[in-house]
């Protein structure tokens, strides 16, 4: 099919365009080009007869068109009016006509744009600035660049007027940047020169440096003032309210105690009309001052607060030293020193961090020590302890219970019996108790500073007669040659005799057996498998004698070195090999076999039928006790003869 391709499709003014013909039919008589989408004699540009190779201009010919034998049309020196459709009319030798239409667009070459601004010196946090990209051009796209980056997303940035205008609302000093605009159309793109936005701001609150406020007599005082400001601030110094000089730096040589006072720096911005001042109090010491410690938290709470201890005063070119408990600082991740060593920070204080803390200032002759400071760390209450620990009392005695919970400030105590409040004291005293005084005794400890409370409940039984005792153990499955086991006979009672039996016999004499806690606790050190026996405790008082149920100690041991049976190591070819492995172990071990180092099966018995000399080699039994975490093995050589 006959088609027209425009090369290029978008044409810049003054350039040329080629209307290239594709699929031109053969056996042509001639062809004509027309301006527009149809054949119109009034709008004929040029005609061409192939036989004569004669080109004939039409009414729409401008003199800038050239027709080629292949029917393509070149138009030079393109003008805006050339935009539009072009129709090729082909007359074939059989006088049958064929038409095709093509088109192109003409765009002007864009000029270099420029930026105009409605405010050349906007004031921070007050003014808005509108940048406009000039000139205004039809069919052009406008783009903006800030510091050669595309525009950031910000509610303070707004594009309008077809993106030709960029408005910055409530300018800030951070808007001081290079702004460029760019115009684009299909045939060109031009970028403006950059415009630097000059935002007026400040002055901010001035900073006086150095920060130290303590000086020795005879030193030079050299204070510098700086305030962020545009244009740069003008500075004035005042001492004790009296104007000194309009400079950024204040220098006073060889100061004396009389130079102590308040030093004010005033920063002024003539464009914004704003003033800001900062005051520092300078102290001049006749002698090196005795240091002292200030704390940012006088009553820190344990495990919650950090405390920063600062050694005062701040003196230039001084070495600061610290001591805790009259020792140099221990290495601890919870202790941090500032770069100048003047501030010691305790992270997440504990009750052990009370101190005392001392700091020192080192001078040429000596080290001046501060007075010690003790931290008042608030903690607790911990779980209260009720003493004595007896749970059984005989009727007629006096019951005197004392409660204590570690706490700072000291805890306030309350006693409850069977949930009923009794008294707000640390000690509870009941004289001449009876069985009616049996019950649940609760001590409640309260820390008024932290607001925390903790309680401990103790069951008190008043009975002349003791109950059947029971044995508690601190280790239900001890490991042989490793663990110790402590058996305790419960309950704990006053005026009670505790006795022990092993397998129905009184305790054997052994350095590994130890009685403690009034014979109430029996400890077995370094248990062995032979300690796996029945342990019974007995209690006796004035009216009763009772035995506990036996507790059998389950000692974990092994695996011992395994034994492979039968012991034979020589076999005849064709026999069955049936090896059994056994190792003393509690609990029973896991078994596995290896032949010549190659893993076989996880069974206690290894069976191979009709062995041959190929079965010669080393047979290893491996045993493993998961409870003790121990392993063992044995290797046996097997020879099979033909």
């Amino acid at each position: 099919k006959l088609t027209i391709e425009s090369t290029p499709f978008n044409v810049a003014e003054g350039k040329e365009v080629l209307l290239l013909v594709h699929n031109l039919p053969q056996h042509l008589f001639g062809y004509s080009w027309y301006k527009g989408e149809r054949v119109d004699g009034n709008r004929q540009i040029i005609g061409y007869v192939i036989g004569t190779q004669q080109a004939t201009p039409g009414p729409a010919y401008s003199g800038r068109e050239i027709i080629y034998p292949n029917a393509s049309l070149l138009i030079q020196n393109i003008i805006q009016n050339d935009t539009g459709f072009y129709t090729l009319h082909v007359i074939k030798s059989d006088l049958v006509n064929e038409e095709a239409t093509g088109q192109f667009r003409v765009y002007p070459e864009l000029p270099k744009p420029s930026i105009s601004s409605n405010n050349s010196k906007p004031v921070e946090d007050k003014d808005a600035v509108a940048f406009t990209c000039e000139p205004e051009t039809q069919d052009a796209t406008y783009l903006w660049w800030v510091n050669n980056q595309s525009l950031p997303v910000s509610p303070r940035l707004q594009l309008s007027n077809g993106n030709r205008t960029l408005t910055l609302f409530n300018v800030t000093r951070n808007d001081t940047a290079s702004y460029k605009c760019e115009t684009q159309n299909p045939v060109s793109a031009r970028r403006s020169d950059s415009v630097i936005l000059n935002v007026l701001y400040g002055p901010d609150a001035p900073t006086i440096s150095p920060l130290n406020t303590s000086y020795r007599s005879g030193e030079n005082l050299n204070l510098s003032c700086h305030a962020a400001s545009n244009p740069p601030a003008q500075y004035s110094w005042f001492v004790n309210g009296t104007f000194q000089q309009s400079t950024q730096e204040l220098f006073i040589p060889n100061i004396t105690v009389n130079n102590s006072g308040s030093y004010t720096c005033q920063a002024h911005n003539s464009d914004t009309g704003l003033n800001r001042t900062t005051v520092t109090t300078i102290t001049v010491y006749a002698e090196p001052p005795k240091p002292f410690i200030t704390s940012n938290n006088s009553n820190p709470v344990e495990d919650e607060d950090a405390v920063a201890l600062t050694c005062e005063p701040e003196i230039q070119n001084t070495t600061y030293l610290w001591w805790v408990n009259n020792q140099s600082l221990p290495v601890s991740p919870r202790l941090q020193l500032s770069n100048d060593n003047r501030t010691l920070t305790l992270l997440s204080v504990t009750r052990n961090d009370v101190g005392p803390y001392e700091c020192g200032i080192q001078n040429e002759l000596s080290v001046d020590h501060s007075d010690p400071v003790i931290l008042n760390v608030l903690y607790g209450p911990d779980d209260p302890t009720i003493s004595p620990s007896y749970t059984y009392y005989r009727p007629g005695v006096n019951l005197s219970l004392s409660c204590h919970a570690a706490s700072n400030p000291p805890a306030q105590y309350s006693w409850l019996i069977d949930g009923n409040i009794q008294q707000h004291t640390q000690e509870l005293f009941i004289s001449n108790i009876t069985e009616k005084n049996s019950g649940l005794y609760t001590c409640q400890a309260n820390n008024s500073a932290s607001g925390h409370s903790r309680t401990t409940v103790k069951t008190i039984t008043v009975s002349a007669e003791l109950p059947k005792p029971s044995i508690s153990s601190n280790n239900s499955k001890p490991v042989e040659d490793k663990d110790a086991v402590a058996f305790t006979c419960e309950p704990e009672a006053q005026n009670t005799t505790y006795l022990w039996w092993v397998n129905g016999q009184s305790l054997p004499v052994s350095p590994r057996l130890q009685l403690s806690n009034g014979n109430r606790t029996l400890t077995l050190f370094n248990v062995t498998r032979n300690d796996a026996r029945a342990y019974v405790c007995g209690i006796q008082n004035s009216v009763s004698a009772n035995r506990s149920d036996p507790v059998t100690l389950d000692v974990l041991y092994g695996p011992d070195t395994p034994i492979i049976s039968p012991p034979d190591s020589s076999y005849l070819s064709g026999a069955n090999l049936n090896l059994s492995c056994h190792s003393a172990s509690n609990p029973s071990p896991q078994y596995s076999w290896r032949i010549n180092g190659i893993p076989q099966q996880h069974t206690q018995v290894l069976f191979i039928a009709k062995i041959t000399p190929n079965n010669n080699g080393t047979y290893a039994c491996f045993v493993s006790n998961l409870a003790t975490g121990r392993n063992n093995s044995i290797v046996k050589s097997i020879t099979v003869s033909a």
Epitope: R394, S463, A464, E465, P467, N495, Q505, S542, S544, A545
Partner: antibody, heavy 120, light 106 residues
């Protein structure tokens, strides 16, 4: 072998006092509590008191406070019951007994009893 | 004081017969203990801590109960069992005995 040997029968006048003894063998009285029990003729048993010979601690039934006094002498392994201001109501057999562990078993050992007769 | 009431006060039983003696306490006690006494002899601890037989006591004897109600049972009466049986509480002072149950052979 554990034994409690009590002193012989007593015939005493009304208003007088008497001191009964109980001597232990086969164990140390310091290691155990000694109880005393009264049994009137054709009557039941009444608990009087116990003593801890190691420290002299005692516990009396209210009825016998002022009437009975318990003491012990560790050197002779003997416990004593002193009865004062005797009346016909005090005519009875008085037993000492002890609850001890003999080996693995808790055993209750009794003396043979001492008969006290109060005459007017 | 905790009062112990034994019943019956006196009873007779034929050989082989089952015998039950009860002891009721005026307040709850931890355990009950039983003593056997034959004429002219000292009492013997027979059952301790409610249900444990003292050394040498035949297995036909048993004890049970809790709180305020306890009992001594002989599964099959024998001639040597004829005696007076006393219950005793040791939970609170003063320690008290029941008045006794006299068991005779029928």
């Amino acid at each position: 072998e554990v034994q409690l040997q009590q002193s012989g029968a007593e015939l005493v006048r009304s208003g007088a006092s008497v001191k009964l003894s109980c001597t232990a063998s086969g164990f140390n009285i310091k290691d155990n509590y000694m109880h005393w029990v009264k049994q009137r003729p054709e009557q039941g048993l009444e608990w009087i008191a116990w003593i801890d010979p190691e420290n002299g601690d005692t516990e009396y039934a209210p009825k016998f406070r002022g009437k009975a006094t318990l003491t012990a002498d560790s050197s002779s392994n003997t416990a004593y019951l002193h009865l004062s201001s005797l009346t016909s109501e005090d005519t009875a057999v008085y037993y000492c007994h002890v609850l001890i562990y003999a080996g693995y078993l808790a055993m209750d050992y009794w003396g043979q009893g001492t008969s006290v007769a109060v005459s007017s | 004081d905790i009062e112990l009431t034994q019943s019956p006060a006196i009873m007779s039983a034929s050989p082989g017969e089952k015998v039950t003696i009860t002891c009721s306490a005026s307040s709850s006690v931890t355990y009950m203990h039983w003593f056997q006494q034959k004429p002219g002899t000292s009492p013997k601890l027979w059952i301790y801590s409610t249900s444990n037989l003292a050394s040498g006591v035949p297995a036909r004897f048993s004890g049970s109960g809790s709180g305020t109600s306890y009992s001594l049972t002989i599964s099959r009466m024998e001639a040597e069992d004829a005696a007076t049986y006393y219950c005793q509480q040791r939970s609170t002072y003063p320690l008290t005995f029941g008045a006794g149950t006299k068991l005779e052979l029928k």
